[in-house]
Amino acid sequence: QSPIFGPQDVSSIEGNSVSITCYYPDTSVNRHTRKYWCRQGANGYCATLISSNGYLSKEYSGRASLINFPENSTFVINIAHLTQEDTGSYKCGLGTTNRGLFFDVSLEVSQVPEFPNDTHVYTKDIGRTVTIECRFKEGNAHSKKSLCKKRGEACEVVIDSTEYVDPSYKDRAILFMKGTSRDIFYVNISHLIPSDAGLYVCQAGEGPSADKNNADLQVLEPEPELLYKDLRSSVTFECDLGREVANDAKYLCRKNKETCDVIINTLGKRDPAFEGRILLTPRDDNGRFSVLITGLRKEDAGHYQCGAHSSGLPQEGWPVQAWQLFVNEESTIPNSRSVVKGVTGGSVAIVCPYNPKESSSLKYWCHWEADENGRCPVLVGTQALVQEGYEGRLALFDQPGSGAYTVILNQLTTQDSGFYWCLTDGDSRWRTTIELQVAEATKKPDLEVTPQNATAVIGETFTISCHYPCKFYSQEKYWCKWSNDGCHILPSHDEGARQSSVSCDQSSQIVSMTLNPVKKEDEGWYWCGVKEGQVYGETTAIYVAVEERTRGSPHINPTDANARAKDAPEEEAMESSVREDENKANLDPRLFADEREIQNAGDQAQENRASGNAGSAGGQSGSSK
């Protein structure tokens, strides 16, 4: 007996599609070997029609596909536009030749069934509405009109012109005439369900003079679209349910045996398992919407369905669209930390992977917000200005060619806790989700800057020192000047490096930065940080105010500017969030639900372009001591 398994008989009718699943034993060799679908000839030879090596025969051109799902140990053969010529014996199998492991499948394609004369065939999807047309002669214009459904020899009345409606069609069936038409009546059946399928007879009049029409109604299950995604990548479900449900609440649910559990809907419901990694985006006024899920996990694989109903929940007889999501564990997307922890006043360096083949793509970092459908306003990008409320404490360091960029956020407060997304305007699969957890600090920060009230005087020399502990001895220390388009490394002087690491004196590890002479444009945020090669570590920030030699009052109160790192007053945090909302024009968060529109984000950011690039030292007035 064959270890390959599938349907032994498949029957369909002309014009339809079939989707044949073949199961194979779960071994490494089987997962990677050639899969094929061939047609058995009278001579015993099995002619390949399609294979996983990319072969596609002429007779299957444009109408067939073969997809391998190694994590399920299955492959699926989809064949569309069936004709009676497709009837025959086939094999689905594995191996370099068509004599390997296989399973016999018999496919029978029949003609569209013969119905009584004048039978009209109506084909509709579940949840849709059918309008059955019933013609009659003038003599029956004033007679009773009815529609019945054939059950064996009997025909059970569905609806008639005396206002009778079968209970199972209540609120779904209506009988009507259009305008002044004297020879035709119509029956609408809405919210179609599978059991509505069958042969209907509409009738005008009674007895031998009655006019009868036959209608065959086919109600189709939505054929799930197969989606094949990598672990840790993202998937977008594009849902188009039609204009008739444009004003109803929308949902995406995941099939679980008989139920379908809602993952997200437009009424604010969201499954906690998808917290921080899902967005629902309305597309237009016709009810189109998309749902983006990032950071795909193995357990996300399964059957998904989108639909619409005023309750925001799945309802029998309402239109749906279906997908089957497969999550491939052999992912090209590297495993990165999904949770990053920080402390108040401290900093975090978040590494964002991107497709190394797209090093020139624009990089972004956004903050996922839970309100209703979820949104992700961009906070920083390679060509996007840093959002207000994040000045002086957020920078993106691109490392071309490394397949990753780093986002540094310092002066952390507990309000920074939440979910953040790394994304680019390139390969949409490379969207990663990070949860940032900020706890209250219980000890002094590792990096400390002196003086803390930093006010420099124009024309004079100003030195600022950054104290670091011995654990950072071997790491590269740097100072950089923060600007809206990054933090530009400055020349600095490491006084601790003169000692041997054996006799590291905790109190004298200092890296200092000197401005000589101080200029007005030196005012701003400066960061002291540590890194090892391309790997960024701890940072701390200080605001340097610059004042005229003759003036007594500084340009900005440095105590206030630097206080943010210590206690982040509530007033300022609230102010920031208001300002952030006012600044939406910068980059629309909804753009990140789909590739076509993410491009617009890049174009828009282009307008905000500033000179310089993170990591360059050009144009700064810092000098070595």
Partner: nanobody
Framework: QVQLVESGGGLVQAGGSLRLSCAAS????????MGWFRQAPGKEREFVAA??????????YSADSVKGRFTISRDNAKNTVYLQMNSLKPEDTAAYYC???????????????????WGQGTLVTVSS
């Protein structure tokens, strides 16, 4: 969930035939994948046959041990699935269970875990 009631079991001589029926309640019966399983005393539940109809195409599956002898069919108008058993052998003796898997059919039709509604079973005894 749909309610399932099997009938048609009984005592039959080897080489004889039986037709099992499984009547289902529920308006969406036609969209369910339906399966027959059997369990002989002291043995594990074993897949026999399954049928799935998606509104346009029908897919029939059967175990190697019954291929060519047993045929599964369904009548959506009557909410019933049948198992026609010919050339019965003593080793076919078992309790036969009807099972339903809601759409979309999840995973392997041979796996009992993919079915969420089960009948009480009907006993088939094949004497030699």
């Amino acid at each position: 969930q749909v309610q399932l009631v099997e009938s048609g079991g009984g005592l039959v001589q080897a080489g004889g035939s039986l037709r099992l029926s499984c009547a289902a309640s529920g308006r969406t019966f036609s969209s369910y994948a339906m399966g027959w399983f059997r369990q002989a005393p002291g043995k594990e539940r074993e897949f026999v046959a399954a049928i799935h109809w998606n509104g346009a195409s029908t897919y029939r599956y059967s175990a190697d041990s019954v291929k060519g002898r047993f045929t599964i069919s369904r009548d959506n108008a009557k909410n019933t699935v049948y198992l026609q058993m010919n050339s019965l052998k003593p080793e076919d003796t078992a309790a036969y269970y009807c099972a339903a898997s809601p759409p979309p059919t999840v995973g392997d039709v041979r796996d009992p875990a993919n079915y969420d509604s089960w009948g009480q079973g009907t006993l088939v005894t094949v004497s030699s």
